[in-house]
């Protein structure tokens, strides 16, 4: 069977006027997953995102991440899009320094 990912979006200050937003997917199986940042619903180009490898997390499941840098104040335009085993979800950037968790149930 498949195990849906936990998706966690975080933000951190990058440089003046910019923040880095990171979307992490963890505890999923099988390892095939789509994880990408979208602006206004449109996927950002590959050269503006950084991806982590899809790695085993020691529990028979996998983890990965994608990050991008955005202008502070434009957070509402951005979402992390996840697709795994025929299911999908979108995840907003949290306000302030809070975290956003979403467990996608099959």
């Amino acid at each position: 069977g498949s195990v849906p990912p936990m998706v966690n979006v975080t933000r951190s200050e990058a440089s003046e006027g910019n923040i880095t937003v990171t979307c992490r997917a963890s505890s999923f199986y099988p390892r095939n997953i789509t994880l990408t940042w979208r602006q206004d619903g449109v996927s950002l180009s590959h050269d503006t995102q950084q991806w982590g490898d899809v790695l085993p997390d020691g529990n028979g499941t996998y983890q990965t991440w994608v990050a991008t840098r955005i202008c502070q104040g434009e957070e509402q335009r951005f979402t992390c899009y996840m697709e795994h085993s025929g299911n999908h979800s979108t995840h907003p950037v949290p306000s302030g320094n809070s975290h956003h968790h979403h467990h996608h149930h099959h």
């Epitope: 602006q39 206004d40 619903g41 449109v42 996927s43 979402t79 979800s89 979108t90 995840h91």
Partner: antibody
Amino acid sequence: EIQLVQSGAEVKKPGASVKVSCKPSGYAFTSNNIYWVRQAPGQGLEWIGYIDPYIGRIIYNQQFKDRATLTVDKSTSTAYLELSSLRSEDTAVYYCSRSGERSNFDYWGQGTLVTVSS
Amino acid sequence: EIVLTQSPATLSLSPGERATLSCSASSSISSNYLHWYQQKPGQAPRLLIYRTSNLASGIPARFSGSGSGTDFTLTISSLEPEDFAVYYCQQGGSLPLTFGQGTKVEIK
């Protein structure tokens, strides 16, 4: 095949409201944003706003923020645009469109003509 | 708001001729955020070129796009009868999303 099917033409009086529907098919409804655009007779294209059907987030063009309301019904996979306090200048074809992987508007509905006349 | 100005407003050409349409932005735009659409009378627009230079699905190779910064160009290398239409550029880099006012390509 991806399609967006819109409701039929409407004739409204000034001051009234209109609600236009858009029913996409051929893809997972909640996986892409729905945009709304209008085109007055003989004029260009004007973006009204968009809604993310999955999380319900709405972004409006400030010009329409006070009169436009975007909603979705996930149970029927339908998006709606409601425009209130109609005036003659709102006479236009209203289009829904889908956000694409690489551009803002990759598939479009056939358009709904809204005529505002006393 | 980024204003997109298209020129010329109307282009009168014959089939087989080359068409060059311009789109000028009031502020610099990343090439990832500039797109072109074609609209024929009584029809909805359709995506033609995305991210400045990439052909959308099903669009013939006689269409091409180029440009950067504030100046972008759509070129039709040899006009076919079905290419006579209105063409719009659109930017998705900043809100509000905006379109140019359109260039009508008509038969001379």
